[in-house]
């Protein structure tokens, strides 16, 4: 079984489906946000370019105890070819500013929607 985004499926999930599901989850997070997401936790912002999925996971995986983003963390791991652990930052990850998780999610969502519209599913 292939497990992506926490859902078991009979075969590999098409990249377009996986990206759409990730977008839907981020939309769900932003729309259901009442109190500050993850209680205002701050994470490193990322360059939304090559290696974006791993960089996003590297940033968000450091936040623990925030159930609202646990599914997103699992889904991002399906897009990242290597295992990511808390405190791990690749050379692609430039640590220049921290932003609230809520802003991180909004920025990521906008970029993923753009990629989806342009047919860039990987």
């Amino acid at each position: 079984l292939t497990c992506l985004g926490g859902f078991a499926s009979p075969g590999p999930v098409p990249p377009s489906t996986a990206l759409r599901e990730l977008i839907e989850e981020l939309v769900n997070i932003t729309q259901n946000q009442k109190a500050p997401l993850c209680n205002g936790s701050m994470v490193w912002s990322i360059n939304l370019t090559a290696g974006m999925y791993c960089a996003a996971l590297e940033s968000l995986i450091n936040v623990s105890g925030c159930s609202a983003i646990e599914k997103t963390q699992r889904m991002l791991s399906g897009f990242c070819p290597h295992k990511v652990s808390a405190g791990q930052f690749s050379s692609l990850h430039v640590r220049d500013t921290k932003i609230e998780v809520a802003q991180f999610v909004k920025d990521l969502l906008l970029h993923l929607k753009k990629l989806f519209r342009e047919g860039q599913f990987n």
Epitope: P36, N39, G40, S41, N62, V63, S64, G65, G87, R95
Partner: nanobody, 116 residues
Framework: GVQLLESGGGLVQPGGSLRLSCVAS????????MDWVRQAPGKGLEWVST????????YYADSVKGRFTISRDNSKNTLYLQMNSLRAEDTAVYYC?????????WGPGTLVTVSS
């Protein structure tokens, strides 16, 4: 649990200096990445600076680069922020935070007012 207590804030004239301190308890301080975050009156949270556990890595927001210096003394479980060349726009409540934790685990903050 995590406890953080900031001190060192106050009223200072533009161009002046202050040194903020934050005493930490309830967690293993020397392996924790630590942040300074601020909130200006009526504004949102703004990240100021981060220091890695080993003190090897220090990171700053563009708005404070070259003026502020973050440091830590792991033997005293204390985080510092040396603020020089202060400007009116640095007026804010400054919070010390264990990185990646929510506001419920931050300290109460210390108010810095820069005014002539």
């Amino acid at each position: 649990g995590v406890q953080l207590l900031e001190s060192g804030g106050g009223l200072v004239q533009p161009g002046g200096s202050l040194r903020l301190s934050c005493v930490a308890s309830g967690f293993t301080f020397d392996v924790a990445e630590m942040d300074w975050v601020r909130q200006a009156p009526g504004k949102g949270l703004e990240w100021v600076s981060t220091i890695s556990p080993s003190r090897r890595g220090t990171y700053y927001a563009d708005s404070v680069k070259g003026r502020f210096t973050i440091s830590r003394d792991n033997s005293k479980n204390t985080l510092y922020l040396q603020m020089n060349s202060l400007r009116a726009e640095d007026t804010a409540v400054y919070y010390c935070a264990k990185a990646y934790t929510g506001r419920s685990l931050w300290g109460p903050g210390t108010l810095v007012t820069v005014s002539s």
